[in-house]
């Protein structure tokens, strides 16, 4: 018996071939001997089966001795043995229809779980193997689960269902809702404008939700809500904003905030959360601000940084085009009685300059 695998919702074509290459009488029946369709001369006739409105054939092939049964919009319950009667012969074809669906939505938040459920006909024992967009393979039976979805899991999942040495392939598009970056750090000199950008890693036709930026300044004992906003059809509208600092927020995506100036009291880290409509959980992005200040007070030249710096960062003071006078893995360095000239304060990571501030020391007479 020939076995054909089909996909729920798809169309399948079961073949039936006569030895004579001409149009002769044929009938397709199901395992209960109920007629599905056949011919009367050059006319297609249909029987009382449940497939009535979804069954068809290709009249153009009859003259060649081919009498296919086409079943549209396949259902799991269409799984059956179909019999083609032609020239006093019976050709049997076993059709097995499978369906593979994502448990909930195909748009899932980063960190959530994806469950794929296989619908299969009674008596079948299929195996399923899925390949994620990042090349990870998962195997299972009726259900497959992936916990802690990552950004790289966004895209087309290819799942192969194997039954009776035959296979059928499913493609499921999964969108992982997340920010492009989990964390970012901005380095600024005191007084400079600060830009925070929160690009999303996905695009959807209509995006609605609400968000908030909480800020923990290094100098403050507790965190503070800097801004709350709504998102409707990708348009951002500010609901409430703190008066210090006076933030500005763009009304178009990607989410974008500006701080009029970087000040030591703003240095610290923030957490932007975005709750999307009809989704449980929130999207998060951490943002950090490091602020540098170089000052000269009497005979003391000082360079300081505020904010979340890693212990391996180096802070140094050097006279332009000369060796560093002082270089430490600390948040403040100073030089007593500095020579006249242009001094540079540098914050660097393994030789790469992250932040630079220049200060001119005038000669003392």
């Amino acid at each position: 018996k020939k076995v054909v695998l089909g996909k729920k919702g798809d169309t399948v074509e079961l073949t039936c071939t006569a030895s004579q290459k001409k149009s002769i009488q044929f009938h397709w029946k199901n395992s209960n001997q109920i007629k599905i369709l056949g011919n009367q001369g050059s006319f297609l006739t249909k029987g009382p089966s449940k497939l009535n409105d979804r069954a068809d054939s290709r009249r153009s092939l009859w003259d060649q001795g081919n009498f296919p049964l086409i079943i549209k919009n396949l259902k799991i319950e269409d799984s059956d043995t179909y019999i083609c009667e032609v020239e006093d012969q019976k050709e049997e074809v076993q059709l097995l229809v499978f369906g593979l669906t994502a448990n909930s939505d195909t748009h899932l938040l980063q960190g959530q779980s994806l469950t794929l459920t296989l619908e299969s006909p009674p008596g079948s024992s299929p195996s399923v193997q899925c390949r994620s967009p990042r090349g990870k393979n998962i195997q299972g039976g009726k259900t497959l689960s992936v916990s802690q979805l990552e950004l790289q899991d966004s895209g087309t999942w290819t799942c192969t269902v194997l039954q009776n040495q035959k296979k059928v392939e499913f493609k499921i598009d999964i969108v992982v809702l997340a920010f492009q970056k989990a964390s970012s750090i901005v380095y600024k000199k005191e007084g400079e404008q600060v830009e925070f950008s929160f690009p999303l890693a996905f695009t959807v036709e209509k995006l609605t939700g609400s968000g908030e930026l909480w800020w923990q300044a290094e100098r403050a004992s507790s965190s503070k809500s800097w801004i709350t906003f709504d998102l409707k059809n990708k348009e951002v509208s500010v609901k409430r904003v703190t008066q210090d600092p006076k933030l500005q927020m763009g009304k178009k995506l990607p989410l974008h905030l500006t701080l009029p100036q970087a000040l030591p009291q703003y240095a610290g880290s923030g957490n932007l959360t975005l709750a999307l409509e009809a989704k449980t959980g929130k999207l998060h992005q951490e943002v950090n601000l490091v602020v540098m200040r170089a000052t000269q007070l009497q005979k003391n030249l000082t360079c300081e940084v505020w904010g979340p710096t890693s212990p391996k960062l180096m802070l140094s003071l050097k006279l332009e085009n000369k060796e560093a006078k002082v270089s430490k893995r600390e948040k403040a360095v100073w030089v007593l009685n500095p020579e006249a000239g242009m001094w540079q304060c540098l914050l660097s990571d393994s030789g790469q300059v992250l932040l630079e501030s220049n200060i001119k020391v005038l000669p003392t007479w």
């Epitope: 404008q193 409707k232 059809n233 348009e235 509208s237 500005q248 763009g250 009304k251 500006t258």
Partner: antibody, heavy 119, light 107 residues
Framework: EVQLLESGGGLVQPGGSLRLSCAAS????????MSWVRQAPGKGLEWVSG????????YYADSVKGRFIISRDISKNTLYLEMNSLRAEDTAVYYC????????????WGQGTLVTVSS | AIQMTQSPSSLSASVGDRVTITCRAS??????LGWYQQKPGKAPKLLIY???SLQSGVPSRFSGSGSGTDFTLTISSLQPEDFATYYC?????????FGQGTKLEIK
């Protein structure tokens, strides 16, 4: 073809009220952001007020906040500007303007209607 | 509100000249800026949107550049019909704000 036609301008005394209308056609009015922009005689352009297409939120320039109200009637494809407590400095040509689909500038403008506030 | 500072306020030039008008924002506004041309007694006309995109139907001699706080409108070769007043507009967020305008006159 997109068309914006303002009406309702005229002479009004200081402290008085006036309602401007802007009849829109040729685009999906209900989903488009719209604004009012004015120009005092011999002066530059000043953005006055806007209404969001997606959520109907309304926005105002500080100079008119609390005195002007922007609104729209989707069934009539009409944008309105209710102007109260009018002052001499509100004298201007008022334009209604349609924003591009993704809020990148005003791609269509009406011909303008003149509002004169004088005793 | 975000302030827009446009310069120069007036400019004299001849047909065929290359002309540059600048606009500076008090805050970073990404590329959310448009340039408009206005002729006496007429409504403004959009030339450039999103800082550098040419509006449909606008001659290619008009170009825009810039991002963040500093923006430029350039007319590569002035034509007689280009003598008008030009405005920049920030549409980064509400309230929108225009620059003071630049009047381009024939020398």
């Amino acid at each position: 073809e997109v068309q914006l036609l303002e009406s309702g301008g005229g002479l009004v005394q200081p402290g008085g009220s006036l309602r401007l209308s802007c009849a829109a056609s040729g685009f999906t009015f209900s989903t488009n952001a719209m604004s009012w922009v004015r120009q005092a005689p011999g002066k530059g352009l000043e953005w006055v007020s806007g209404i969001s297409g997606s959520n109907g939120n309304t926005y105002y320039a500080d100079s008119v906040k609390g005195r002007f109200i922007i609104s729209r009637d989707i069934s009539k494809n009409t944008l309105y500007l209710e102007m109260n407590s009018l002052r001499a400095e509100d004298t201007a040509v008022y334009y209604c303007a349609k924003e591009r689909d993704n809020w990148n500038g005003f791609d269509y403008w009406g011909q303008g209607t003149l509002v004169t506030v004088s005793s | 509100a975000i302030q827009m500072t446009q310069s120069p306020s007036s400019l004299s030039a001849s047909v065929g000249d290359r002309v540059t008008i600048t606009c500076r924002a008090s805050h970073v506004i990404r590329n959310d800026l448009g340039w408009y041309q206005q002729k006496p007694g007429k409504a403004p006309k959009l030339l450039i949107y999103a800082a550098s995109s040419l509006q449909s139907g606008v001659p290619s001699r008009f170009s825009g550049s810039g991002s963040g706080t500093d923006f430029t409108l350039t007319i590569s070769s002035l034509q007689p019909e280009d003598f008008a007043t030009y405005y920049c507009l920030q549409d980064y967020n509400y309230p929108y704000t225009f620059g003071q305008g630049t009047k381009l006159e024939i020398k």
